[in-house]
Interface confidence: medium
């Protein structure tokens, strides 16, 4: 349905609070270096303009597209050229090229200082003094650091952030109440950002067919009682929502997400028995709840798939008539029967099935040719099963920190050209799979582990794309979305890599090490470990373990010393010399 004024339409649909929040997120995700006050000014101007259009949709400029209105507003920023360099050239373009240009300049790793958490009393005072500004600042700081954060979901995080302060700033022990809640929001927020980044990468790099296939598999696992047509409807609507959000169309995205939640709640009977408790909640909470809802129980009487997809004489006929629908039905039928498989595995099976039909339906005896297609699935299923089993055993044996270190060594040997901070970040996150998934029952391990690894490896791909240094990484990231994880798993020691020259500065430490948090200490040690492997890629596990144990002992000794700095100055060179000898 067309509206005379798109901006008035969205303002009325979303309401002022959500409209302003989403425009602030959109602007912060595009202009990530602009000061907060500048963004607030731009948002207020857009909001005032939207109100004039609500009053009179025929008023001047009210008929312009949102991209035109928002792009024009962003291009009024005086310091665009100095702050953003070539991004300023976007402003010379017309829509839709201008928006595409802004999208291409989104920076996944912006050069912004880490967020420092002030004292609880300072935060509570700021919250009470000006709640609106406090919450806007949260939206701004998260959005500029996570330029693909799912905007309507960020509004939900902001609502939880507000609720945490409202409750805890009244509490007797403010810190005990607030800090765990903020930690939880931070960790959930990082996970949400990374999951959304994979959705956007899927849409932008591999097209909406890839995203739709992912969504068919995931929604069929969640809603195994729903019919294929129902799952298709949800997939179509969900694809539109994420295409809009990933494309910077945040108002349309939030509006369509609300419509999708409404549709799901009005059609619970044909979707899932698990939606009821979500549907009683207010909008933001409802949409979040629906996205995270647990899998419904599988229908008890599901027949074998072989009858329709292997034994039937109509397989090639059905495939030829409507390939995507037939393959979609196959994926739906397979996924609803296998909540114990990762989505990526299900997509690999669908891909293998498609390849078999392409080959066999052109053969002299198609049925004879595809009769054993399900047998060919076995190695595809066993590979992630074995990987999860081996890595969970290793995690249980080593614990999280040492498991991360094992992965650091493994990945540094595979792709030593990748920057040390990226290897540390990615390997630490890969290592978190243990605590997240290995404690789960067998039937939930693989979907948890492999789909989480896909999200983490996408972060590696996104960072590497910005500064490409390894052909192996480029190959694994670009050849096939569903085979990214197996591609990285299959990489061996890079024999062509020329070891990095030893730099004593990299292994020089000071007394400030002693005041770091446990996490910061780990990152320092893991950074040193990566540098060691880059220097000696063929070092054995035992050699590296010996050096790291010595390192931990040296740091512990100096942090207990009276004159810490003197100890680091004296013991540091000894540690370096001993390490070089141990690795020679």
């Amino acid at each position: 349905d067309t509206h005379k004024s798109e901006v008035a339409h969205r303002f009325k649909d979303l309401g002022e609070e959500h409209f302003k929040g989403l425009v602030l997120v959109a602007f912060s995700q595009y202009l990530q270096q602009c000061p907060f006050e500048e963004h607030v000014k731009l948002v207020n101007e857009v909001t005032e303009f939207a109100k004039t259009c609500v009053a009179d949709e025929s008023a001047e400029n009210c008929d312009k597209s949102l991209h035109t209105l928002f792009g024009d507003k962003l291009c009024t920023v005086a310091t665009l050229r100095e702050t953003y360099g070539e991004m300023a050239d976007c402003c010379a373009k017309q829509e839709p090229e201008r928006n595409e240009c802004f999208l291409q300049h989104k920076d996944d790793n912006p050069n912004l200082p880490p967020l420092v958490r002030p004292e609880v009393d300072v935060m509570c005072t700021a919250f009470h003094d000006n709640e609106a500004t406090f919450l806007k600042k949260y939206l701004y700081e998260v959005a500029r650091r996570h330029p693909y954060f799912y905007a309507p979901e960020l509004l939900f995080f902001a609502a939880r952030y507000k609720a945490a302060f409202a409750e805890c700033c009244q509490a007797a022990d403010k810190a005990a109440c607030l800090l765990p809640k903020l930690d939880e929001l931070r960790d959930e927020g990082k996970a949400s950002s990374a999951k959304q980044r994979l959705k956007c990468a899927s849409l932008q790099k591999f097209g909406d067919r890839a995203f739709k296939a992912w969504a068919v598999a995931r929604l069929s696992q969640k809603f195994p009682k729903a019919e294929f047509a129902e799952v298709s409807k949800l997939v179509t609507d969900l694809t539109k929502v994420h295409t809009e959000c990933c494309h910077g169309d945040l108002l349309e995205c939030a509006d369509d997400r609300a419509d999708l939640a409404k549709y799901m709640c009005e059609n619970q009977d044909s979707i899932s028995s698990k939606l009821k408790e979500c549907c009683d909640k207010p909008l933001l909470e409802k949409s979040h709840c629906l996205a995270e809802v647990e899998n419904d129980e599988m229908p008890a009487d599901l027949p074998s798939l072989a009858a329709d997809y292997v034994e039937s004489k109509d397989v090639c006929k059905n495939y030829a008539e409507a390939k995507d629908v037939f393959l979609g039905m196959f994926l739906y039928e397979y996924a609803r029967r296998h909540p114990d498989y990762s989505v990526m595995l299900l997509l690999r099976l669908a891909k293998a099935y498609e390849a078999t039909l392409e080959k066999c339906c052109a053969a002299a005896d198609p049925h004879e040719c595809y009769a054993k297609v399900f047998d060919e699935f076995q190695p595809l299923v066993e590979e992630p099963q074995n990987l999860v089993k081996q890595n969970c055993e290793l995690f249980e044996q080593l614990g999280e920190y040492k498991f991360q270190n094992a992965l650091l060594v493994r990945y540094t040997k595979k792709v030593p050209q990748v920057s040390t901070p990226t290897l540390v970040e990615v390997s630490r996150n890969l290592g978190k799979v243990g605590a997240k998934c290995c404690k789960l029952p067998e039937a939930k391990r693989m979907p948890c582990a492999e789909d989480y690894l896909s999200v983490v490896l996408n972060r590696l791909c996104v960072l590497h794309e910005k500064t490409p240094v390894s052909e192996k990484v480029t190959k694994c990231c670009t050849e096939s979305l569903v085979n990214r994880r197996p591609c990285f798993s299959a990489l061996e020691l890079d024999e062509a890599y020329v070891p990095k020259a030893f730099n004593a500065e990299t292994f020089t430490f000071h007394a400030d090490m002693c005041t770091l948090s446990e996490k910061e200490k780990q990152v320092k040690k893991q950074t040193a470990l990566v540098e060691l492997v880059k220097h000696k890629p063929k070092a054995t596990k035992e050699q590296l373990k010996g050096v790291m144990d010595n390192f931990a002992a040296f740091v512990e000794k100096c942090c207990k010393a009276d004159d810490k700095e003197a100890c680091f100055a004296e013991e540091g060179p000894k540690f370096v010399a001993a390490s070089q000898a141990a690795l020679a």
């Epitope: 019919e227 294929f228 047509a229 298709s232 409807k233 044909s270 329709d308 037939f326 039928e333």
Partner: nanobody, 119 residues
Amino acid sequence: EVQLLESGGGLVQPGGSLRLSCAASGFTFDTSSMLWVRQAPGKGLEWVSVIHQSGTPTYYADSVKGRFTISRDNSKNTLYLQMNSLRAEDTAVYYCAKFPSRKMKFDYRGQGTLVTVSS
């Protein structure tokens, strides 16, 4: 009892158009996805198009994509198929049916309406 009654078929020249209708009764039409299938003389049933209960999304067999449009009016319990740029190979009996619960078969279909494309 489920009833589906197709109409609108007839003789048309290649390149011409026809609009088929299907009146549904005996079930809750607005919660059922529907489809059109066809059967050419001496051939098996061929899947043509599907429409979700809400009107979107729609799906088409590759052989009719871009020429046929499926639609529905839930207030009238009626399904439509607008057929443009008709070809000789579109000649068939066209049936409307409830979309399959599970696979590419269906639970109920009507008596059909004959479409003949010939000069």
